[in-house]
């Protein structure tokens, strides 16, 4: 960068190289240059020449100020005119950044997603810094007193196999950087406690024409845990409010789940669990469409959801897509 | 200018307790853990623990734990160490320096020389 | 604990040549490493934090570099100056602990 150039002289910003976005500072530049006593001093801002708000303060020095500065980043320079040579003298170049201190870390959230092999640590770091924030991810055992610190710039992946104190955690955020520093409250956790089992997944569906036709929904989850509790939701494509029905799963053999829907509409499906009893929910599913027929029996497979327009199918599924108006992963 | 302004040399007795300041300016004092390191003559540095001004949580390596007590005052920007039972075997220099996750230790205090001698 | 084992302990250069510092750390540290100076009588000083990233203020002839449990610590054309004990310090379980230091002797 620029701060890497041979300088003849020197150039300071006031307060900091790196201050609060929207604060008034001043950039000095003191030459320093062999057999020459600058006409002038010039600055220059990402290469471009300032023409306003230059000072000189003595034979050698010159200040420009700026009033509310908002850029994130400059590279400022500045050179020196002098006697009998044609060319302008770079003096020296410096780096300068705005931004702000970071909040205070907050909503943080930590997951093991069964058979990841980690615990996934989350939180919210509130407004934008603009500036290098650090953040380190304090993991405090409750049995040892032994302090982890995970340095990260977003989330964290923690293997549990380093998770040696124990089952009972401590864990706090601290968020820095050249402005100020903020912790979070402290997460007490509990590893049994935190463990969100295998995606379930919406494998096929059928609609049987029954006297009041039917429609079975197929559904699967890998995982190990014994007692699960699952949620499924679905609605119209056409309608803004989805149906919940909730179920206890015991995930031995694939779930089959009974919905009486109207005739010829498209619907949407997701599923999600938890460990029952337990805080946190798995992400919804991604979105399953089954459109039930006007009379016909009709099977909807998870291997016809992707683009099957021109199949000759009677059912034309969309690929997964966005047409929930919550499909956050509810984790809290 | 940062500054980490230690309190003087102690000469205690065995048995006794000490307790050494450790004085900060030229930053924001709750931004930064205050860390404690004993260095013994001729030896490397050893970790105390680290105070956080902002909340008072505390870290401390298990060998310090029951010989040392972190505090800090914050309207006079002043972190403490008091050490207690002490014996030959804690005669060293104690050092105070400020870190957080975006600096690190990044200045340190003069030190304070503690001498245990009957 | 993690134990940092430094090497080599003494280290004896003339100027102008470029030397290594090797910390070795017992288990995987995730650059979670900090490297210092200390002089005769003085207060250890921060040259690089978090394995290689560089300090306002030290002369960029200390660069450090390294990860998972391998780090070193370069001085590029050493100056007579650069005399002292060098420390590393690992930041990522606690207890932190340091190195037992690497003397450096100028010639």
């Known amino acids: 960068g620029i701060t890497n150039i041979n300088c003849s002289g020197h150039i300071w910003v006031e307060p900091a190289t790196i201050f609060k976005m929207g604060m008034n500072i001043s950039i000095y530049c003191q030459a320093a240059i062999k057999n020459c006593q600058p006409r002038k001093l010039h600055f220059y801002k990402n290469g471009i020449k300032e023409r306003f708000q230059i000072t000189r303060i003595n034979k050698t020095t010159a200040r420009l100020w700026y009033k509310n500065f908002l850029e994130p980043h400059a590279s400022m320079y500045c050179t020196a005119e002098c006697p009998k040579h044609f060319q302008e003298t770079l003096i020296c170049g410096k780096d300068i950044s705005s931004g702000y201190p970071p909040d205070i870390p907050d909503e943080v959230t930590c997951v093991i997603y069964e058979y990841s092999g980690n615990m996934t640590c989350t939180w919210n770091a509130g407004k934008l810094t603009y500036i290098d924030t650090k953040y380190v991810v304090h993991v405090k055992s409750l049995e040892t007193e032994e302090e982890q610190q995970y340095l990260t710039s977003s989330y964290i992946n923690i293997s549990t196999d380093s998770l040696q104190g124990g089952k009972k955690y401590l864990v706090w955020v601290q968020a820095a950087n050249a402005l100020g520093m903020e912790e979070s409250k402290q997460l007490q956790i509990h590893l049994d406690d935190i463990v969100i089992p295998s995606a379930a997944v919406i494998s096929r569906a059928e609609t049987i024409n029954a006297t009041v036709p039917k429609t079975i929904i197929y559904w699967d989850s890998q995982t190990t845990i014994e007692k699960v509790s699952c949620e499924m939701r679905y609605k119209a494509t056409t309608n803004q409010t989805w149906n919940v029905k909730e179920f206890d799963t015991n995930f031995t053999y694939v779930q089959q789940s009974e919905f009486y829907l109207e005739p010829n509409i498209k619907y949407v499906f997701q599923v999600r669990c938890q460990e029952t009893g337990k805080r946190y929910w798995q992400p919804w599913s991604s979105l399953f469409f089954h459109k039930t027929p006007e009379t016909v029996p009709q099977v909807t497979s998870k291997a016809f959801q992707h683009d099957t327009w021109n199949s000759g199918l009677t059912v034309a599924s969309i690929s997964t897509g966005h047409l929930t108006s919550d499909n956050r992963g509810d984790i809290g | 200018e940062v500054q980490l302004q230690q309190s003087g040399p102690e000469l205690v007795k065995p048995g006794a307790s000490v307790k050494m300041s450790c004085k900060a300016s030229?930053?924001?004092?709750?931004?930064?853990?205050m860390n404690w390191m004993k260095q013994s003559h001729g030896k490397s540095l050893e970790w105390i623990g680290y105070?956080?001004?902002?909340?008072?949580?505390?870290g401390y390596n298990q060998k310090f734990k029951g010989k040392a007590t972190l505090t800090v005052d914050k309207s006079s920007t002043t972190a403490y160490m008091e050490l207690r039972s002490l014996t030959s075997e804690d005669s060293a220099v104690y050092y105070c320096a400020k870190s957080n996750g975006y600096y690190a230790l990044d200045y340190w205090g003069q030190g304070t020389t503690v001498t245990v001698s009957s | 604990d993690i134990v940092l084992t430094q090497s080599p302990a003494t280290l004896c250069v003339t100027p102008g040549e470029t030397v290594s510092l090797s910390c070795r750390a017992s288990q995987n540290i995730y650059k979670n490493l900090h490297w210092f100076q200390q002089k005769s009588h003085r207060s250890p000083r921060l040259l690089i934090k978090y394995a290689s990233d560089s300090i306002s203020g030290i002369p960029s002839r200390f660069t450090g570099s390294g990860s998972g449990t391998d780090y070193t610590l370069s001085i590029n054309s050493v100056k007579p100056e650069d005399e002292g004990i060098y420390y590393c310090?690992?930041?990522?379980?606690?207890?932190?602990?340091f190195g037992g230091g690497t003397k450096l002797e100028i010639k």
């Open positions: 105070i956080s001004p902002k909340n008072g949580r505390t």
């Open positions: 030229g930053y924001t004092f709750t931004d930064y853990y």
């Open positions: 310090l690992q930041g990522y379980s606690t207890p932190w602990t």
